[in-house]
Each structure stands twice: as C-alpha cells, then as structure tokens.
Amino acid sequence: QTSVSPSKVILPRGGSVLVTCSTSCDQPKLLGIETPLPKKELLLPGNNRKVYELSNVQEDSQPMCYSNCPDGQSTAKTFLTVYWTPERVELAPLPSWQPVGKNLTLRCQVEGGAPRANLTVVLLRGEKELKREPAVGEPAEVTTTVLVRRDHHGANFSCRTELDLRPQGLELFENTSAPYQLQTFVLPATPPQLVSPRVLEVDTQGTVVCSLDGLFPVSEAQVHLALGDQRLNPTVTYGNDSFSAKASVSVTAEDEGTQRLTCAVILGNQSQETLQTVTIYSFPAPNVILTKPEVSEGTEVTVKCEAHPRAKVTLNGVPAQPLGPRAQLLLKATPEDNGRSFSCSATLEVAGQLIHKNQTRELRVLYGPRLDERDCPGNWTWPENSQQTPMCQAWGNPLPELKCLKDGTFPLPIGESVTVTRDLEGTYLCRARSTQGEVTRKVTVNVLSPRYE
C-alpha cells in the first residue's frame, strides 16, 4: 500500500513543497514519485520512505507516489493547489469629467489570479460596494452602471480583488486598482448671455459681459472671450451656480469692419458658445470750413460742412441737398454775422444704429468803426452843477479806440460821472479809430446856468 504526505497542499505560485512517499512493505522493489515538476530527493535512512522537494510550482499539479511491493503495485496522489493574486486589476479608462444624469459604465478587468474559486471582484465608490461577483473568464470582467449625480463629484471609484484563503488557513489577499476620480458637471443647454455694444468706435473702449446660470461646479468653468483674433482678459465673478465675465475691449483702426465677438464656456468635456457681431467704425467729427475765419464786412463767405463719406449732414439745422456728407452756404458778411456760429451736425448709420457728431466754428467779421446818434448823441444840454455821465459808444470789430477832444486838447470824460461846469461847454470832436479805419462825430455840450429870482 502506497501513501503520500501531505495529501493536499496550497502554496504560492513558484513555491516549493516537501512530499513524502511511503509504502507499507519493508523491501519495495520500487518507490518513487511521478511529476513534471523539478524534484530533488532528500536522503533518508530506510527503504520504505522517500522525501522529495518539488520546486517552482507554477500551476495546480497532482504528483503521484508509486511503489512496487511483492504483493503488487500501488499509487497515491497529492493535490497541489497554487495560489496567486491577479497580475492586473484595472478599471477601464473613462473621461474624468462626466455630465450629471449620464449613465456611467464602470468596467473592471482582472488578469490572472488563482484559485479562481476563491477569487472575487468588487466594484466600489469610496468604501461603498457597488457590485461583487466571482472572477470568471480570462481576463475576468465585471461591469456596473452608475447614474451620475451631482454629489458624486470628486468621488473615487475603484476595483478590488479578494483572494480568500482563510478556509485553507491562510489570509485574505486584496489587490486594488488605481482609483478613478469622477468629476461631475452640469453645463446647461442654453448658450451664455453676451451683452456688448453692437457698434464700437475706433480708439475707444467698450465693455463686454458674458454670463451663464445653472453651472456645476461653477469654479471649474473656463470662460474664453474674444473679439476677432483678440483674446480678451475678463474679470470673472462667481455666484452659487453662475458666473459673470466682464472685459474691456479696445479697438483700433486695424479692427475696422464687422468683427465676431465670441464667448465660450468650457466645463468638463463640453462647451457652449455665443457669437455676436460688433461693427467697429471710424467717424471723425465733421469739418466746418470757412473760406476765412476772419473777414471784412461785405466779403462773400463760403461755409462748408464735410463729414464721413457715408454720413448725412445738416448745416445750421438745414439738411444737405442732396442728402449726403457735404453741405455749404454762401453769405455776404455783415456786422450782425460777427460771432455767428456755423454748426455742422453729422449722422452716421453703423449697422442700423445712428451715431451723431457735431462741430461748430465761429465767423469773425471786421467792421466799423461806427459812431451814430443812437449810441453817441450829437447834443447834450445839462444844468450847471448837476452830476452827469457823458456817454458815447463807438462800434466796430476790433473795438475802436474813442477820444472826444475840445479844441484838440480838452477831453470829454466818456463814461465817467462829472459835475457839470462852464468849462465842459463847447463842441467836441469824437474820433473812433481801429485797424479798419476811423470816423469822427461832433458832439456839442450845452451848460444851462441856474436862474436867480
């Protein structure tokens, strides 16, 4: 009778085991072991027992002890069970960002591991078990579906294998995959709201505001604002689930024309974009051209108003005929025209919006000098010893210098309060002089003596 010890062994892959083959007869003709494994016999005294070291056990094996005794041949098998933890425990790769409400399939793949009867695959969210299944197939695959929720944001998903050899007197061997950290997000289907000027003048600044509500997590949202090829640098303000991005935009003559203003919001692996057109325009103030800004009375003056070629102008409130960017008027300069304003108003339609600009010029008319009865009376009669103020106003542009002299030497104190004396009586020659020439006027002062009764 042949016997083997131990009859059952569980050992780690690549490990070694000592197997003893024994026989019941004292003088066996043969005693040995049959195995494909590398073996080494350990020398022992006696003929009815042999010990073998079996090494590099890579897989389950059933070495067989045999003996040939006088009463016949017999065999005995030992059962070697190899255990090893899986070589690969992996979650199938997934985008880290997942939209809330999406069904997310987690797939765990397990390569190797034995004995499979003792190997279990567990899918976890944090420490919470989502699914537990025995490892079947090579590679073994376990899947589960998770409905992505907002509160899953930042959760770690992993896959764990459990090789439970505690019934065999060993321990529980665990292998865990690299975690998959889920980033959940909500990007609403509505595009961002973009508020900006429809039109913008060159060499000016405008403000652009892009906003969106209903985002999660709002702090992770990326906002890209651009006008044509010009990236804008917004200041972003966050609310609970909203943001508002405000940027200043400066435009130059090179930007003139229709430009695309874009606001793109990127969250997770999705984006929403709003496009708007902004028309950049150049509109210098209209020009008011006077043939000469300063003319003499009686001179013909042409006043021209010129604006942007697409503008419509009015000159002193009168529309150009025909309607367009130029208007003009002709006038013969009179003293009344001195200081007269000529106002050119221009309206430019840019993308349907009306832009208004204005320029005003003043005409200076040189005239005079003038001395007339109304402003410089030719005759004064005043009572002696009364207080009087001689008035004589000379008109002209430039304002004339005025002198009133009696006998070429005695001045009449124009505009000053004087006590009337006999000396004041007489005829004065008032002379008004300016660069435009001179005029004279005779002024007579009569002094009335008081009558004594």
Partner: antibody
C-alpha cells in the same frame, strides 16, 4: 407726400407673396423705409428697414422669412414662405427724420400708408 | 439691443380723467422717442416725437416727457376718442434683431 401699400391678398401657406409700397411726393433716395405689421389681436411689430442706399436690417424673428428691396419709387416686402402666423395688416412707413435744433437725423415713422391685409390660409 | 418695456398693458380711465403711460428703454436713447396712437383699421398716428415735441394737428392734451431710458406719455382731460392702443418707439437704432416698439398700452375710456 404719401405712401401706399398694395399686393395684400389671400394666399396658401408656402406661396411667396410680394407687397409693394409706393412713395409719392418725396424721393426714396433721401429716406429710410420700414415695414411694420399687426397680426389680429397683437401689437405693432417692426419687420425691417431699407436705407437710402439699399442696406437692409431685420428684426430677429423676421430674418430669412422676409426680404426687403427697392426701386427708385417703390419698396417691396417679400414674404418668402408664408405661414398662417403671417396673417396680418402690413404697413409701410417712412422712417427717417431730422431734428432742426441739433441737426441730427433719427429714426421716426412720420408717414404711414393705410396698410394692406395679408391672409394666409390653407 | 434696445428693448422697450411699456407699462401698463391696459388701463381704464373715465372721461375727463388723466392717464399716464410709461416706456422704459434697456439702454439710453437720449430723446429719440416717438409716441403713436393706433386705432383698429387705421394706420398708427404719430402724437409726439423727440420725446416731448407735439406733432402737428395733435391736441395739447397729449404730453410727452423724459429722456435717456425713462419716458412718459400723459393724456389729460381724456375724451372717448382717445380710446386706442398707444405705442412708444425708439428712434435710435434699427440694427438686426432690434426691438423698435414697446408692447403697447390699451386705453379703455369709460
């Protein structure tokens, strides 16, 4: 000075229809002209405008549904593919004025036609 | 754009009374505002232009005021003939996608 619309009639959905606005006593080369409509029980709705030079602008809801064009004396409004929602009275209005105190031009519907009725029905 | 918000949508007033209609622009339109009166079967009638200037042939019972974004039309000594829908209209822009008219105010005279 006057404007008058014509061309309004009963049409079946999808049949293009062109309305014409005829200007008298002023030159279209000096004015912007707008089309406005009023559907039964609704308010006034601006459809679009054509400038003195022929540039057009449209309300957002009207883009692609209407086309405005002009000749020297008329302004046309084409309803490209009418639907029952386009049943309305259509008005043409001169939409350009200037303010003599500032000298600026502005949009002002100062002259209106009597309107023309368009009925879209199957 | 220049959204025009008109309030109230409807108002009832007794003959001889006063009615006030407000119009608010979403952005400043300076004084470029026009008020219209519209009766069924007729073209709209221009009452006020440049926010406060009375159109020729319009009764002085109609008064317009305001500038920038807030405007008011006041009808005093209301007559039965004033029963109509009143609209404000901005004269600043006719851009693509623009809002030109307010929503209208129906005035019912008792």
């Amino acid at each position: 000075q006057s404007v008058e619309e014509s061309g309004g009639r009963l049409v079946t959905p999808g049949t293009p229809l062109t309305l014409t606005c005829t200007a008298s006593g002023f030159s279209l080369s000096n004015y912007y002209m707008s089309w406005v409509r009023q559907a039964p029980g609704k308010g006034l709705e601006w459809i679009g405008i054509i400038s003195d030079s022929g540039t057009t602008y449209y309300a957002s809801w009207a883009k692609g549904r209407f086309t405005i064009s002009k000749t020297s004396t008329t302004v046309d409004l084409k309803i490209t593919s009418p639907t029952t929602e386009d049943t309305a009275t259509y008005f043409c209005a001169r939409d350009w004025s200037y303010d003599s105190s500032s000298g600026y031009y502005y949009y002002d519907m100062d002259l209106w036609g009597p309107g023309t009725l368009v009925t879209v029905s199957a | 754009g220049y959204d025009m918000t008109q309030t109230p949508a409807s108002v009832e007033v007794a003959v001889g009374g006063t009615v006030t209609i407000k119009c608010q622009a979403s952005q400043s339109i300076n004084s470029w505002l026009v008020w219209f009166q519209h009766k069924p079967g007729q073209p709209p009638k221009r009452l006020i232009y440049k926010a406060s200037t009375l159109a020729s042939g319009v009764s002085s019972r109609f008064k317009g005021s305001g500038s920038g974004t807030h405007f008011t039309l006041t009808i005093s000594g209301v007559e039965s003939a004033d029963a109509a829908t009143y609209y404000c209209q901005q004269g600043y822009s006719r851009s693509d996608g623009e809002h030109v008219f307010g929503g209208g105010t129906e005035v019912v005279v008792k």
